[in-house]
């Protein structure tokens, strides 16, 4: 009696179970009563990453330098090419189809996490005792200067954007 279901890594065709093609190979011809499934390897610029019955392989992703992309990992017959972004840029999506410049943290904010090829800069507001007076994609919030350690006194209080201003202590004669 012809099968109605097949084992894992097989498919049902013409009332018989044929082996799927292994990753990196495409289907050329179904199995017959005389032969196993005919499969052939994907070409150098192509891949298939699963056990399959695809009659054509998928084209490797192209990392377009005009979009700021570069190859992070070259594709094989079983894996797609992985793109990442050039220095100073990050991916706009998980599939990394294009890149945008890293965000800078405005004055009053510091860098919590420096951007990578796949993630943008993460900024955080400078807490009390810290400041940032620049727009930067790298600089963290810096602590206010400690006037006391310099034997000075605070002449002007600091903010999240400015450092304290220290001055000499008033000497009582």
């Amino acid at each position: 009696e012809p099968p109605t279901a097949c084992r894992e890594k097989q498919y049902l065709i013409n009332s018989q179970c044929c082996s799927l093609c292994q990753p990196g190979q495409k289907l050329v011809s179904d199995c017959t009563e005389f032969t196993e499934t005919e499969c052939l390897p994907c070409s150098e610029s192509e891949f298939l990453d699963t056990w399959n019955r695809e009659t054509r392989c998928h084209q490797h992703k192209y990392c377009d330098p005009n979009l700021g992309l570069q190859v992070q990992q070259k594709g094989t017959s079983e894996t797609d090419t992985i793109c990442t972004c050039e220095e100073g840029l990050h991916c706009t999506s998980e599939s990394c189809e294009s890149c945008v410049p890293h965000r800078s943290c405005l004055p009053g904010f510091g860098v919590k996490q420096i951007a990578t090829g796949v993630s943008d800069t993460i900024c955080e507001p400078c807490p009390v005792g810290f400041f940032s007076n620049v727009s930067s994609a790298f600089e963290k919030c810096r602590p206010w200067t400690s006037c006391e350690t310099k034997d000075l006194v605070v002449q002007q209080a600091g903010t999240n954007k400015t450092d304290v201003v220290c001055g000499p202590q008033d000497r009582q004669r």
Epitope: V28, S29, D30, T32, T35, E38, L40, S43, T55, R56
Partner: antibody
Framework: EVQLEESGGDLVQPGASLRLSCAAS????????MSWVRQAPGKGLEWVAS?????????YYASWAKGRFTISKDTSKTTLYLQMNSLRAEDTATYFC?????????WGQGTLVTVSS | DIQMTQSPSSLSASVGDRVTITCQAS??????LAWYQQKPGQAPKLLIY???KLASGVPSRFSGSGSGTDFTLTISSLQPEDFATYYC????????????FGQGTKVVIK
Amino acid sequence: EVQLEESGGDLVQPGASLRLSCAASGFDFNSNAMSWVRQAPGKGLEWVASIYAGGSGSTYYASWAKGRFTISKDTSKTTLYLQMNSLRAEDTATYFCARGITRLPLWGQGTLVTVSS
Amino acid sequence: DIQMTQSPSSLSASVGDRVTITCQASQSISSYLAWYQQKPGQAPKLLIYDASKLASGVPSRFSGSGSGTDFTLTISSLQPEDFATYYCQGTYYGSTTISAFGQGTKVVIK
């Protein structure tokens, strides 16, 4: 029943054109590559052309067949074709269609093409 | 194109003999090699594919070996029904696909 049946063979004059057909039945025509092989009277087998399965339908030819012969298929009719142009006396042969490329487990019985003036 | 050189072109043997036919490809074809048997007035019949896999229903006295450029078909003990012509078919698969058959080996009764 799984079978291939060729037709279209004829006696033609040199320079003429002819289209051979191969009707496939009993299997999924769309997921199988197909080939044409010929055999001149009393001679050996000679690969002519192959066409890949599915939408890609990439075609490949023996160097002597390029430009003169064209392999094609009509999935809706489950039929394989071989268009032969500018026929020569040396094209006289039985033409077989077969399923597959690197191995040919299923063959038709062949159709005879005779090129003679 | 690839060339498949098959030898011998003919051989005479007796029932029970061990018969060996060789096939050489003009360039490496990995294991994309098949062997066929053809009897007069019939279409060829597939015996061996992928150089060494026996097609279902083919007697186990037939075996194939080799890879790259050199291949062999062996009939371990020739039977009366084995007198026929044998062909190898090699396929080069790379940037293009090209197939070719050997010239054939006619096995006749001694």
